[in-house]
């Protein structure tokens, strides 16, 4: 028997993916485990194999269908189970009644691009990926800019309180290399969390024009 503290956390990307992490102190490393999803009002069910991500935690992605298909609604409840093989039988290690739209984590924004760059400012746009049409415009974004000599953790967060898929960065230093990231979160959901940060976009401000001699 496996003893210890167990934690089973899952998020829905709002379309066709449920990502789960299961951690268990004292779990057996060579045990085969999986996550099983059983919606209360759908004809399908889905399974994924838990793969180790650290000493005592495993992760897997339940792929429910085509990436942009709306596989679950706000009314669905999905029973999620962690099953581990014990000899010839499967043992239930963890179970939860999962409300997908209370546990959202969207995909990271994609297609970041510099729309326009000047000496002191830069306009950047992006797109959201695999986000449900349910949200309409009720999303918020956080962005951060990496300046030379600083870390991402030191970068101040800029908050966009509406679905605005662009930003104009001001007060930049001329002829300087920067990096930019953005993440997204729906307003919906008690346990909803921020998406992962986007891939960083590197850009360089234009050099200042040389002043004329007087």
């Amino acid at each position: 028997a496996v003893n210890g503290t167990s934690q089973f956390t899952c998020f829905y990307n709002s379309r066709a993916n449920i990502s789960c992490v299961w951690s268990q102190d004292g779990a057996l490393q060579d045990t085969s485990c999986q996550v099983h999803a059983w919606p209360d009002r759908r004809r399908w069910n889905q399974t994924c194999e838990l793969l180790p991500v650290s000493q005592a935690s495993w992760a897997c992605n339940l792929i429910l269908g085509a990436p942009d298909s709306q596989k679950l609604t706000t009314v669905d409840i999905v029973t999620l189970r962690v099953l581990c093989r014990e000899g010839v039988r499967w043992r239930v290690m963890a179970i939860q009644d999962f409300k997908p739209f209370e546990n959202l984590r969207l995909m990271a924004p994609i297609s970041l691009q510099v729309v326009h760059v000047e000496t002191h400012r830069c306009n950047i746009s992006w797109e959201i990926s695999q986000a449900s049409h349910y949200f309409e415009r009720h999303l918020e974004f956080e962005a951060r800019t990496l300046s030379p000599g600083h870390t991402w953790e030191e970068a101040p967060l800029l908050t966009l309180k509406q679905k605005q898929e662009w930003i104009c960065l001001e007060t930049l230093t001329p002829d300087t290399q920067y990096e930019f990231q953005v993440r997204v979160k729906p307003l919906q959901g008690e346990f909803t969390t921020w998406s992962p940060w986007s891939q960083p976009l590197a850009f360089r401000t234009k050099p200042a024009a040389l002043g004329k001699d007087t």
């Epitope: 709306q70 609604t73 706000t74 739209f101 349910y134 009720h138 008690e190």
Partner: antibody, heavy 117, light 107 residues
Framework: EVQLVQSGAEVKKPGATVKISCKVS????????IHWVQQAPGKGLEWMGW????????EYAPGFQDRVTITADTSTDTAYMELSSLRSEDTAVYYC??????????WGQGTTVTVSS | EIVMTQSPATLSVSPGERATLSCRAS??????LHWYQQKPGQAPRLLII???QSISGIPARFSGSRSGTEFTLTISSLQSEDFAVYYC?????????FGQGTKLEIK
């Protein structure tokens, strides 16, 4: 500009069926949810259900499930709500509305249905 | 289903004063609570979502708050156009349900 324009008032006999239309403009109908809400004099606002035009799914409130049918015609950007086996307590104003599943951002002007023998 | 209870049924307030409307859920609904305003002969209009998030285009005098299962809509300084019926609505458990409304009238 987002608009939802509903069909006109109806007078029906008990046991009959009523079908109300909701013509929308100003947004992508094919990617939207259209909801129907009943506002009866003594009962207040009651959610009847919705149609998800992208997923092609409907969701009905248990209190209306047996008698209501919500449909959509994406070629004309029009949603329909049909309520059958009418009784006097179905006398109400019926609203179509657009929103995500959780709340209603834009509403039609309402259609009054009177059920009387 | 979840029962939403609004109080008071009628609230009489003078223009320029503050109005506080209450909505209580029969069970925990997290922040899945939304507020609407309805004037006579008109459809309801969405004001506040998720307990406290204002909808764009709604005047800043409208604000929402939450304490457990009790939600409050506050109108900081009443204007003549604010006298109407206000409804709360939960979206935690299907079917979504509305409160019976609070009528805000001129004192």
């Amino acid at each position: 500009e987002v608009q939802l324009v509903q069909s006109g008032a109806e007078v029906k006999k008990p046991g009959a069926t009523v079908k109300i239309s909701c013509k929308v403009s100003g947004f992508n109908f094919k990617e939207s949810l259209i909801h129907w809400v009943q506002q009866a004099p003594g009962k207040g606002l009651e959610w009847m259900g919705w149609i998800d035009n992208e997923a092609g799914e409907t969701e009905y409130a248990p209190g209306f499930q047996d008698r209501v049918t919500i449909t959509a015609d994406t070629s004309t950007d029009t949603a329909y709500m049909e309520l059958s086996s009418l009784r006097s307590e179905d006398t109400a104003v019926y609203y179509c509305a657009r929103g995500g599943p959780w709340f209603l951002s834009y509403w039609g002007q309402g259609t009054t249905v009177t059920v009387s023998s | 289903e979840i029962v939403m209870t609004q109080s008071p049924a009628t609230l009489s307030v003078s223009p320029g004063e503050r109005a506080t409307l209450s909505c209580r859920a029969s069970q925990i609904i997290s922040n899945n609570l939304h507020w609407y305003q309805q004037k006579p002969g008109q459809a309801p209009r969405l004001l506040i979502i998720y307990g406290l998030q204002s909808i764009s285009g709604i005047p800043a005098r409208f604000s929402g708050s939450r304490s457990g299962t009790e939600f409050t809509l506050t109108i900081s300084s009443l204007q003549s156009e604010d006298f109407a019926v206000y409804y709360c609505q939960q979206s935690n458990n299907w079917p979504w349900t509305f409160g019976q409304g609070t009528k805000l009238e001129i004192k």
